[in-house]
Interface confidence: low
């Protein structure tokens, strides 16, 4: 999996999007987890509604929210009040039974300076990435990481590496 970098600004919200094949993942709940180390487990942060048909309802765990557009095939995670400790490697997952398929590897970076944006305050920009495999950026300030990179960067924004 490529790693997409999303950069956000400390104190602001960062939106991470994970596109997927809506037919292939039909009926599956989704989850957002944080990678613990380069080869460690992925610790669940938040998952979509227990009832798949209600996946569009936003669910929160602390400052992290998740919502799933099951028809359009886009999982959206919102990190509210982004903080430096939020930086790191995450995964969007599709759940089936006790198994989980990785939809996207995400490197979240947190930028400290609000002036270090692209331009508009509501735009997301790409950030630096960690040692990951084939990372790439997306417009919500996201970008791809490279192979072998490790996920523990700073502030982040999202914008396909803008």
């Amino acid at each position: 999996h490529n790693t997409t970098v999303f950069q956000g600004v400390a104190g602001q919200s960062l939106q991470v999007s994970c596109p997927y094949d809506s037919m292939k993942h039909w009926g599956r709940r989704k989850a957002w987890c944080r990678q613990l180390g380069e080869k460690g487990p992925c610790q669940r942060v938040v998952s979509t509604h227990n009832l798949w048909l209600l996946s569009f309802l936003r669910r929160w765990n602390g400052s992290t929210a998740i919502t799933d557009d099951t028809l359009g095939g886009t999982l959206t995670i919102t990190l509210r009040n982004l903080q430096p400790h939020d930086a790191g490697l995450y995964q969007c997952q599709s759940l089936h039974g006790s198994e989980a398929d990785t939809l996207r590897k995400v490197l979240v970076e947190v930028l400290a300076d609000p002036l270090d944006h692209r331009d508009a305050g509501d735009l997301w920009f790409p950030g630096e990435s960690e040692s990951f495999e084939d990372a790439h950026v997306e417009h919500s300030i996201s970008r791809s990481l490279l192979e072998g990179e490790i996920p523990f960067p700073p502030t982040s924004h999202h914008h396909h590496h803008h």
């Epitope: 490529n2 790693t3 970098v5 400390a10 430096p84 400790h85 930086a87 790191g88 970076e109 930028l111 400290a112 300076d113 270090d116 944006h117 692209r118 920009f125 790409p126 950030g127 630096e128 990435s129 960690e130 040692s131 990951f132 084939d134 990372a135 790439h136 950026v137 417009h139 970008r143 791809s144 990481l145 490279l146 990179e149 490790i150 996920p151 523990f152 960067p153 700073p154 502030t155 396909h160 590496h161 803008h162």
Partner: antibody, heavy 116, light 107 residues
């Protein structure tokens, strides 16, 4: 004013290691990734990797994994890059550059010469 | 890895000329493209970020355009001090990659 001050030139023997430094000032060191870039004589630029000073997280270009190791000392706002098992191919100028929207801030470069 | 190809490799221009430097990415990188100028024995200097965004302190004669995989750095009315090598950088995916550079000389 943001400044990145790199250590001086190094003349090292093949097979040896070298550790260079990049002292940052003018901003909060732990807030931005520090990147390292290689430029061989007369050649283009190669991104080596980066480190996030706040937690020591690193990311490497696969080409430089095993060759370069990035570390930081937060108390002195200094980033380090160690290169090991040096060969003539490692002779180059190495720059540190601060992250942001593009690399707006660069060190002056550290020239490493590998020669017997 | 994303390969960045710059053209021409070098060019010689007359002061006052308008110059266009090309950079092509091996795959779409949206507008995650940065331009740098490097003068002899100096560190690179950021000229343009995100394909077209200007940088404080950089003369207005430098401008950038493009999106996707094709990008252009334009210098409107070249000045003698603009000599150097110009690099484009993929800021979209890791590993970050740079073009081979375009060497600008003044006649």
């Amino acid at each position: 004013e943001v400044q990145l001050q790199e250590s001086g030139p190094e003349l090292v023997k093949p097979g040896a290691s070298v550790k260079m430094s990049c002292k940052a000032s003018g901003y909060t060191f732990t807030d931005y990734n520090m990147h390292w870039v290689k430029q061989s004589h007369g050649k283009s630029l190669e991104w080596i990797g980066y480190i996030y000073p706040n937690n020591g997280g690193t990311g490497y270009n696969q080409k430089f994994k095993g060759k370069a190791t990035l570390t930081v000392n937060k108390s002195s706002s200094t980033a380090y890059m160690e290169l090991r098992s040096l060969t003539s191919e490692d002779s180059a100028v190495y720059y540190c550059a601060r992250s942001g929207r593009g690399f707006a801030y660069w060190g002056q470069g550290t020239l490493v010469t590998v020669s017997a | 890895d994303i390969v960045m190809t710059q053209s021409p490799a070098s060019l010689s221009v007359t002061p006052g000329d308008r110059v266009s430097l090309s950079c092509r990415a091996s795959q779409s990188i949206s507008d995650y493209l940065h331009w740098y100028q490097q003068k002899s024995h100096e560190s690179p200097r950021l000229l343009i970020k995100y394909a077209s965004q200007s940088i404080s302190g950089i003369p207005s004669r430098f401008s950038g355009s493009g999106s996707g995989s094709d990008f252009t750095l334009s210098i409107n009315s070249v000045e003698p001090e603009d000599v150097g090598v110009y690099y484009c950088q993929n800021g979209h995916s890791f590993p970050y990659t740079f073009g081979g550079g375009t060497k600008l000389e003044i006649k």
